[in-house]
Interface confidence: low
């Protein structure tokens, strides 16, 4: 069978001698000269020449990948002495690899462009495009400006993807003291082989004319954004803060301010539209909401067509006005033969407030129950509590149910605290204090869990 | 993509100002806290301060305040860090931090400046 | 303040092997907590926050446990790119780092 791989070969080759490409071979091919190569096809004989010996094939000319970026050919193998092929006629494939040989051209000398005086910076306002004849690399495409009166108002980006030179505003332009600007862009490619630098400067340029448009400017805020706070125990008609814009255009018109109702549909904010303060009009809640993003639009009286809009993000500041309560529903038990000041549940508490400091619940018995109880409540310090035995051993059939009520406090100011009830049931159990039979009502809720009353 | 590119590597002698500048790119300079940290040859973290862009709103670690300044250009998208009267253990690599806003300033943070030497030495 | 303490401050190990940070603070911090990577020359680089939360595009490796003051930074198999020191932070009142553990190869 033939070996060889695909064949690769630099186009615009300068070298004195020919350049090789390659070998075909056949694995019949013992060496002794008893086989001849042949070849046919793109430019054999002409282009491309086989040594019919040893197969080795050289191209005899400097090729141009820009006129012709692939050769199809056809090897043959033929047994000197009886004439006939050893293997089958087999097309192959010489590419020809690319190198910078092209500079980019621009299709047009000139270009021109318009832009409205607000445009800021960093706006794109048009492109232009050069072309390369080359492939990859070698195609690549770098703009920049390099003369004229608009250098330092205006930028050039090269997009990668396109190619194309993208004109962006570089600094705030203003129709009153300019109109047009005149810039020489060029575009270059960035990856010059030095061995192929006498083939040219690989650049051309062109002249890109920028006409400014007037604008009637809307108002423009203070600032980009307004972050303002205020306590959820807020009156209605508590003023947050305020907000200014003005008229940039000389006229300087007067505005007037709104909420964009859209970003409060409950309308718990107002603002005073001749000075943009902004105040409450309805009560707030930390725990239903903690950021409120509205926007406020200034517009201008003598032009209403003229408006700008403005993010409020207004953060609640929190107040300890939530009790803390149990986090889940307790249903616990305990063995009849239980022994005293054992664990039998570890109790957890939430609260929907969030102090800066972080919560301290202390757990306590209610004072209701506090004396004469069958269980006793260890508060750990670190917003937990145990329920612990208190005596000695239970009789399911004396009581076979206690409701233990239990008051969380939040320790902060003012202190908020709540009672919540945890259902304890008198099982008996194995010697490993498994339990064995209890109240119906326990197996039907095996520690399940709510919001303790 | 987020980048966060700082200025060069600077030496100062001892009661000097040092202004170090962190340009920010890929998302909404006015949008995220910027933070402030440095880092002693061989040594750990330690955090200097914040800017809210979006206001100028800062807060100082205790341990520099009066003599850290932390500013934010919303034009160009830069932070600057300033510190004054520098002595020879202010000798560190100082960093710029996006903060990802989780409740309170800045959280954790997502991408850092690749630092900037500040040599103290007489 | 919260100090942040972390252990050990260096290890050695070799590739494939699991690896544990520790790191304990000197006060509740719930959940608030984040892990850094960083290696010689260059910016710390996040990993995990809010204690267990891979960050985007850290390999699966890693991964973070923890509540309240003790924490972990799990390797499951180390690679020849995790050597580097690694942080712990609080952000739950404050900023505060751990003093770091450099991860070197055995």
């Known amino acids: 069978s033939w070996m060889w791989n695909q064949f690769f070969l630099l186009e615009e080759y300068t070298g004195s001698d020919y350049q090789y490409v390659g070998k075909l071979h056949s694995d019949q091919d013992r060496g002794d000269g008893s086989l001849k190569y042949i070849l046919s096809g793109d430019g054999a004989g002409d282009l491309f020449i086989i040594n019919e010996n040893t197969g080795d094939i050289q191209a005899t000319k400097r090729l141009d990948r820009e006129e012709k970026p692939v050769y199809i050919l056809r090897a043959q193998a033929i047994n000197r002495r009886t004439g006939r092929p050893v293997e089958p006629e087999s097309e192959f494939i010489i590419k020809i690899h690319d190198i910078n040989d092209n500079e980019p051209i621009f299709p047009q000398s000139t270009y021109q462009f318009k832009t409205p005086e607000s445009s800021p910076p960093g706006t794109p306002i048009g492109r232009i495009k050069a072309s390369d004849a080359d492939v990859g690399e070698n195609a690549e495409i770098e703009y920049s400006i390099t003369d004229g009166e608009g250098l330092d108002m205006f930028d050039v980006i090269t997009d990668q993807e396109t190619q194309e030179g993208i004109i962006t505003v570089k600094k705030l332009l203003d129709f009153e003291k300019k109109k047009v600007y005149t810039l020489k862009v060029e575009a270059s490619n960035p990856y010059v082989e030095p061995r192929f630098l006498y083939l040219g400067p690989f650049k051309d340029s062109a002249t890109v004319r920028i006409v400014v448009e007037d604008v009637d400017e809307p108002p423009v805020f203070s600032k980009l954004a307004y972050i303002l706070q205020i306590r959820e125990d807020a009156q209605i008609n508590t003023t947050i803060g305020s907000v200014t814009a003005q008229d940039p255009d000389a006229a300087r018109n007067p505005v007037k301010y709104s909420v964009d109702r859209h970003t409060d549909m409950d309308r718990i904010f107002n603002i005073d539209s001749g000075n943009g303060s902004i105040f409450t009009s309805k009560l707030l809640d930390r725990e239903t909401l903690l950021w409120h993003n509205i926007t406020v639009i200034a517009t201008e009286i003598n032009n209403p067509k003229q408006s700008s809009r403005v993010p409020l993000y207004i953060k609640v500041l929190d107040v300890n006005d939530n009790a803390p309560e149990f986090a889940e529903f307790y249903e616990t038990f305990v063995c009849e033969k239980a022994k005293a000041d054992q664990l039998i549940q570890t109790l957890h508490a939430v609260d929907k407030d969030d102090p800066y400091s972080g919560h301290q619940f202390s757990f306590s018995l209610a004072p209701e129950a506090a004396s004469g109880s069958n269980f006793t409540i260890q508060d750990n310090k670190d917003n937990t509590a145990g329920i612990l035995t208190r005596k000695n051993g239970y009789n399911r059939h004396e009581m076979s149910t206690y409701l233990l009520p239990v008051v969380i406090s939040d320790n902060d100011y003012p202190v908020q605290s709540s009672t919540g009830t945890v259902t304890v049931r008198v099982c008996a159990c194995d010697h490993h204090g498994n339990m064995q039979s209890c109240h119906a009502e326990a197996l039907i809720h095996p520690t399940g869990l709510s919001t303790g009353a | 993509e987020v980048q966060l590119v700082q200025s060069g590597a600077e030496v100062k002698k001892p009661g000097a100002s040092v202004k170090v500048s962190c340009k920010a790119s890929g998302y909404t300079f006015t949008r995220n806290f910027m933070h402030w940290v440095r880092q002693a040859p061989g040594q750990g973290l330690e955090w200097m301060g914040w800017i809210y862009p979006g206001d100028g709103e800062t807060e100082y670690n205790q341990k520099f305040q009066g003599r850290v300044t932390i500013t934010a250009d919303r034009s160009t998208s830069t932070a600057y860090m300033e510190l004054s009267s520098l002595r020879s253990e202010d000798t560190a690599v100082y960093f710029c931090a996006r903060g990802v806003y989780g409740g309170f300033a800045g959280g954790y943070f997502d991408f850092w400046g690749q630092g900037t030497l500040v040599t103290v030495s007489s | 303040d919260i100090q942040m303490t972390q252990s050990p401050s260096s290890l050695s190990a070799s590739v494939g092997d699991r690896v544990t940070i520790t790191c304990k603070a000197s006060?509740?911090?719930?959940?608030?907590l984040a892990w850094y990577q960083q290696k010689l020359g260059e910016g710390p680089k996040l990993l995990i926050y809010?204690?267990?939360t891979l960050q985007t595009g850290v390999p699966s490796r890693f991964s973070g446990s923890g509540s309240g003051t003790d924490f972990t930074l799990t390797i499951s198999s180390l690679q020849p790119e995790d050597f580097a020191t690694y942080y712990c932070?609080?952000?739950?009142?404050?900023?505060?780092f751990g003093q770091g553990t450099k991860v070197e190869i055995k």
């Open positions: 809010d204690a267990n």
């Open positions: 932070q609080q952000y739950y009142s404050g900023w505060a």
């Open positions: 006060q509740n911090i719930y959940k608030n």
